[in-house]
Interface confidence: low
């Protein structure tokens, strides 16, 4: 995206502005720049499953009836415009909300090219002041918009059909020399604008659609379906430094907040102030001879705090997440400078009360002390506040670094990206994807149970109308009881005239068992809200039990676990609906219905309308587990 000008030099800003800030280093380190980015990573498995489940090979369908794919990256304009401040040609001030009709308007900027993505294995979108103006404000006289979008349709369509590997899109502040802290502020504004990746795959009928939101009213022979995904951070406020830990030695601007704010040139009655050690050695800050003074000061810059009587000053970390018990706050303070004050650290978890962190002092060299506090692994994202409470007429304190260390264990604990999926009905009603293809009509015209579901691979969506749908039995002798697919044509089953998977447990002298095994299903996406749905019925007296076993193919070894069980049942001849969460399934798997019965058993066991939720393969929860408060 185009390179924007520095905010201090934007056309139309007053000539006599504040003095120019010192420049920040031209090249942030790779890690620092990385930490300013918002990364969207769509796993390769999503592409594989979307292709297998939704996109049949091109030869099997007419060109006109082929599903289409679209994509975009959207950001709310308001936080981005607030960063720029009032600008000429903006019809509403950045501080106030956009007018209602403008909020849904969006301006679309060109995204990246397939060529770039193929070459770099990732698409980097740089967002600067000019792009914000172009995308959110536009030419003078045009209404301001509420949404800035990058068009990624070409790219997503190529990736989903022909691409390989994962799709990685990095959104980051445009890199250029400007005033101190610009990239950090731009990064914060980008995160506040809740960037989200939008994908859409929709099936078309006999004519290609212009717009997926402008569907023609469907006729009975017209088939269409529309799936949408939004990938966004489950905690958009979460600092991306969270992935790498936070280490701030005050040599460069940090992602910390200060209260009262960090000193600037216009505010001479400073509290927090970033000063280089050379300057400290020239200032009359410490008692004792100059030689000692320079020896005590660390190299580089540090924070100096000048406080009046009984005041409170705070340094606040960005939002973080920890995946390690060993996550620790470490702060280096100068102990001789603050005899009349004390430091307190607070853990501020999201949606929970604040609590104090036990600070353990470790004396260091030349009067510096490292205060360490164990943070551990709070369930929720958190911030850490370091408060200096002075108690005396005047107090001086120095901080050399502020770090959150060892907060990640194994995979990055950074922001958790969720890929939320939905199914849009013809009338505009939006369902969760899990509601599609579950044998319950949720759309007014039933399109959520339509052709898309019947085209899923064998076993995913089975009402046994076309046979066993991949369910098989071992080699059977003529006298072995068998599972069968047939109708329940019987006066007692007026409500269920279609086919089902049945087993008759007729009276036998010795115990009997019968097993039927499903087709094999791929491994669900990690942390997807995966479910198995089915209806079941037992009519008559079952002297025995029926189990549903999930078998995982773990590195060649088969591991079975019972996921459902019913025993010694006197059936009511009523169909019952069952939804089973398939948790912690990490390998390909299949299902087995195992019935066992003994003497005196005269029951019919029936299963029908079996479906594996599309969520298993096309949805990613932002959280590995449900958030809960800890004591």
């Amino acid at each position: 995206v185009g390179s924007g000008m520095g905010t201090g030099q934007r056309a139309g800003s007053p000539a006599a502005g504040p003095p120019l800030q010192p420049r920040e280093p031209l090249s942030y380190s790779r890690l620092q720049r990385k930490s300013l980015a918002v990364d969207f990573v769509v796993p390769s498995l999503f592409r594989v499953y979307a292709r297998d489940l939704l996109l049949p090979p091109s030869s099997s369908e007419l060109k006109a009836g082929r599903p289409e794919a679209r994509g975009s990256l959207a950001l709310d304009c308001a936080p981005l415009l607030r960063l720029l401040g009032p600008a000429p040609g903006v019809s509403w001030t950045a501080g106030s909300p956009a007018p209602a009709e403008a909020r849904t308007l969006s301006r679309v900027l060109k995204g990246g090219s397939v060529r770039k993505l193929r070459r770099a294995k990732q698409l980097v979108l740089e967002l600067g002041e000019e792009a914000i103006l172009e995308g959110c404000v536009g030419p003078p006289g045009e209404a301001a918009v509420g949404l800035l979008q990058f068009n990624l349709s070409e790219l997503f369509s190529w990736w989903i059909r022909q691409g390989e590997g994962r799709l990685r899109i990095r959104l980051m502040p445009e890199k250029k020399a400007s005033e101190v802290g610009r990239e950090g502020r731009l990064s914060a504004a980008i995160r506040a604008s809740q960037p989200r990746l939008l994908f859409q795959i929709f099936g078309t009928g006999h004519s290609s659609l212009e717009s997926p939101t402008n569907m023609p009213s469907p006729s009975p022979d017209y088939f269409t379906w529309n799936l949408t995904w939004i990938m966004k951070d489950s905690f958009p406020f979460l600092s991306h430094r969270s992935r790498y830990g936070l280490e701030c030695s005050f040599d460069f601007p940090c992602e910390l907040e200060y209260s009262p704010p960090l000193h600037d040139l216009r505010n001479q009655s400073w509290s927090w102030r970033r000063i280089p050690s050379e300057e400290a050695s020239q200032m009359d800050l410490l008692d004792g001879p100059g030689a000692e003074r320079s020896k005590e000061m660390p190299r580089g810059s540090f924070l100096l705090l000048n406080t009046s009587a009984d005041s409170k000053h705070t340094i606040l970390s960005p939002w973080m997440r920890s995946s390690s018990e060993h996550c620790t706050l470490a702060v280096s303070v100068h102990r001789h400078l603050q005899p009349s004050g004390r430091y307190i650290a607070q853990l501020l978890p999201h949606n929970e009360a604040a609590r104090e962190i036990l600070l353990m002092p470790t004396p260091g060299k030349h009067g510096w002390t490292v205060l360490q506090g164990r943070i551990g692994r709070p369930d929720n994202p958190f911030r850490v506040a370091l408060e200096y409470i002075s108690s005396g007429n005047r107090s001086l304190s120095a901080v050399d670094f502020f770090a959150l260390k060892n907060c990640s264990e194994g995979t990055s604990p950074g922001s958790k990206m969720a890929l939320q999926s939905s199914f849009t009905c013809w009338n505009g009603t939006v369902l969760q994807l899990g509601q599609a293809c579950d044998f319950h009509q949720d759309c007014a015209q039933g399109e959520d149970e339509s052709q898309m579901c019947r085209k899923l691979p064998v076993g995913f969506y089975c009402n046994f109308e076309d046979g066993f749908c991949g369910w098989t039995q071992g080699t059977l002798s003529p006298h072995t009881p068998q599972w069968q697919v047939r109708t329940l044509k019987d006066a007692r089953f007026q409500d269920h005239q279609d086919h089902a998977l049945l087993l008759s447990t007729t009276d036998v002298p010795a115990s009997e068992s019968a097993t039927v095994t499903s087709a094999t299903f791929p491994a669900p996406i990690k942390s997807s809200p995966c479910e198995l749905r089915m209806s079941w019925l037992i009519r008559g007296v079952l002297r025995g039990n029926v189990s549903l076993v999930l078998v995982e193919n773990k590195t060649g070894k088969e591991q079975g676990r019972m996921v459902w069980h019913v025993a010694a049942y006197e059936g009511l001849s009523l169909w019952q609906w069952m939804v089973l969460p398939l948790l912690d399934v990490s390998d390909r798997f299949w299902l087995q219905m195992v019935a066992w019965w003994g003497q005196g058993s005269r029951a019919i066991v029936a299963f029908d309308n079996i479906s594996i939720s599309l969520d298993c393969y096309l949805t990613i929860s932002g959280e590995d587990k449900i958030l809960q408060n800890t004591a």
Epitope: E325, A353, R355, E356, R374, N629, A631
Partner: antibody, heavy 120, light 106 residues
């Protein structure tokens, strides 16, 4: 079973020092802080301080700075508290108690207590 | 330091009674309030943490409630084994501080 076993009762002279011990078993010693609490009829329960056995870091209640010194030996899963310059004020029961590092403000298991008598 | 005021300092009740002990903090402690039981032999056990959560192995007749600065412990159906002194403790700010205790007699 999880246990915090404290050393037996002590009788010491005023001005002397004493070291109380608390041996942990049934859990990973370095996964929990060890806290020490004093109980007197006058002041009730008072928090003395805590040690992080993993790092050896300590934190003290200002009231007990200089009075108590906390240490821990990872190899024997034992926490120690040395009490210095003893007076009759230091004569009650001392408890060790463990606390989870994060997400918890409670002491979930306590030792049985050690009675200290300071008398000439 | 946060002051914890516990009331009453002692109370007498009959078996089967419902008993409530109160604890007031000198400032908002954000639900970081724990209750302990000290038996006559000196043994101390955690009963309730984070205002209302029962520690493992504690009978369900014990319950806790409250918010801000006001908290309470309730024993719904008093049993002989509940004869003890009960303490509240705040864990919101350092140093952790305890209430003066409530001696429960049958």
């Amino acid at each position: 079973a999880l246990q915090l076993q404290q050393s037996g009762a002590e009788l010491v002279r005023p001005g002397a020092s004493v070291t109380l011990s608390c041996k942990a078993s049934g859990y990973t010693f370095t996964d929990y802080e060890m806290h020490w609490v004093k109980q007197t009829p006058v002041h009730g329960l008072e928090w003395i301080g805590a040690i992080d056995p993993e790092t050896g870091g300590t934190a003290y209640n200002q009231k007990f700075e200089g009075k108590a010194i906390l240490t821990a030996d990872k190899s024997s899963s034992t926490a120690y508290m040395e009490l210095r310059s003893l007076t009759s004020e230091d004569s009650p029961v001392y408890y060790c108690a463990r606390r989870r590092y994060y997400g918890s403000s409670s002491f979930d298991y306590w030792g049985q207590g050690t009675t200290l008598t300071v008398s000439s | 330091d946060v002051q914890m005021i516990q009331t009453p300092s002692s109370l007498s009740a009959s078996l089967g009674d419902r008993v409530t002990i109160s604890c007031r903090a000198s400032q908002d402690i954000g639900n970081y309030l724990n209750w302990y039981q000290q038996k006559p032999d000196g043994t101390v056990k955690l009963l309730i943490y984070y205002t209302s959560r029962l520690h493992s192995g504690v009978p369900s007749r014990f319950s806790g409630s409250g918010s801000g600065t006001e908290y309470s412990l309730t024993i719904s159906n008093l049993e002989q084994e509940d004869i003890a002194t009960y303490f509240c403790q705040q864990g919101s700010a350092l140093p952790p501080t305890f209430g003066g205790g409530t001696k429960l007699e049958i």
